[in-house]
């Protein structure tokens, strides 16, 4: 069974996925939709990295342009360092600037969504 | 066949409010965004804002903040723009529109409803 | 905000004639997508992603350009393209729409 078939039998279940999991659909050539990652939890879908969901929606990655703006897209690209979602070349803004550092403060993220940053 | 049907024309005081509504059918609501487009008589198209039925994730054109609030409930397939303090400039039709997730085009448009402020 | 310029903004074409209307935009967008819409009529997608027809439009419609000069052309005029056409964006927000150019038939 090839990935995209693999996709279209676990798609209906993805919407709890845990991260670990999503990390694993990663490596097998799903070419996840839109509507799919957009359904993704939150919290599981902020800790991928900027090649694991280009790995996980494949040529639609294209797609995150156009939700940039929407929950969980625009979450996820907080917490991307601009110069790893430049290698996209789709023109994603938000990212954390170069030279700064990210503190894992879950306290303070907590209370205003963002991750804390360190200027350089 | 895909149809976004949207409801009747209004005619309302300045300062009142109204709600207009967006029945989609056809295809999977949760598949696409339903997007708002604003057009004055004899003018432009103006993009409103749009929300992921999904997540009710909304966002706005910087000048629709306040006066445009967007919601949907799937259960019925429908999408809900709700105007506020209504004065003459917003005497316009207003479309829906659907937008596939991750793509920047609408394919479908609803057939416009339109809306008279005036005392 | 990304400005759409189309011109010309009114033009006329006699049937079987070529006609091609411009959008030219202030920034680099990555797509341009097409609209017609006939009086007292919802708008209809012609274009998508610069090039693509939509489903269901004659083939005489044709999509082109980059960066920031696209065009629309029709291969062959027919009274029933006679309507206005705006372009849209969607690489920067907000989204927006060209001020449109108006066809009519000779």
């Known amino acids: 069974m090839n990935g995209s078939e693999y996709f279209v039998k676990i798609q209906s279940f993805l919407g709890g996925a845990p991260t670990e999991d999503l990390k694993a659909l990663s490596q097998q050539n799903v070419s996840m939709d839109l509507a799919t990652f957009m359904k993704l939890r939150t919290d599981a879908v902020l800790p991928l990295t900027v090649a694991e969901v280009q790995k996980l929606l494949g040529p639609h990655v294209e797609g995150l342009k156009a939700e940039e703006r929407h929950r969980p897209v625009r979450d996820w690209i907080l917490r991307q360092r601009q110069d790893d979602l430049d290698t996209l070349g789709l023109g994603l803004q938000g990212g954390i600037p170069n030279g700064y550092l990210v503190l894992d403060l879950s306290m303070q993220e907590a209370l205003s969504g963002t991750p804390c940053l360190l200027g350089p | 066949e895909v149809q976004l049907q949207q409801s009747g024309p209004e005619l309302v005081k300045p300062g009142t409010s109204v709600k207009i509504l967006c029945k989609a059918s056809g295809d999977t609501f949760t598949a696409y965004n339903m997007d708002w487009v604003k057009q004055r008589h004899g003018q432009s198209l103006e993009w409103i804002g749009d929300?992921?039925?999904?997540?009710?994730?909304?966002i706005y054109n910087q000048k629709f903040e306040g006066k445009a609030i967007l919601t949907v409930d799937k259960s019925s397939s429908t999408a809900y723009m709700e105007l506020r303090s209504l004065t003459s400039e917003d005497t316009a039709v207003y479309y829906c529109a659907r937008r596939k997730l991750g793509r920047g085009y609408f394919d479908y448009w609803g057939q416009g409803t339109t809306l008279t402020v005036s005392s | 905000q990304i400005v759409l310029t189309q011109s010309p903004a009114i033009m006329s074409a006699s049937p079987g004639e070529k006609v091609t209307m411009t959008c030219s935009v202030n920034?680099?967008?990555?797509?341009i997508y097409w609209y017609q819409q006939k009086p007292g009529s919802s708008p209809r997608l012609l274009i998508h992603d610069t090039s693509n027809l939509a489903s269901g439009v004659p083939v005489r419609f044709s999509g082109s350009g980059s960066g920031t000069s696209y065009s629309l052309t029709i291969s062959r005029m027919e009274a029933e393209d006679a309507a206005t056409y705006y372009c849209?964006?969607?690489?920067?927000?907000?989204?927006?729409f060209g001020g449109g150019t108006k066809l009519e038939i000779k």
């Open positions: 849209q964006q969607w690489s920067s927000f907000p989204y927006t």
């Open positions: 920034l680099s967008v990555r797509y």
């Open positions: 929300i992921n039925p999904n997540t009710d994730s909304t």
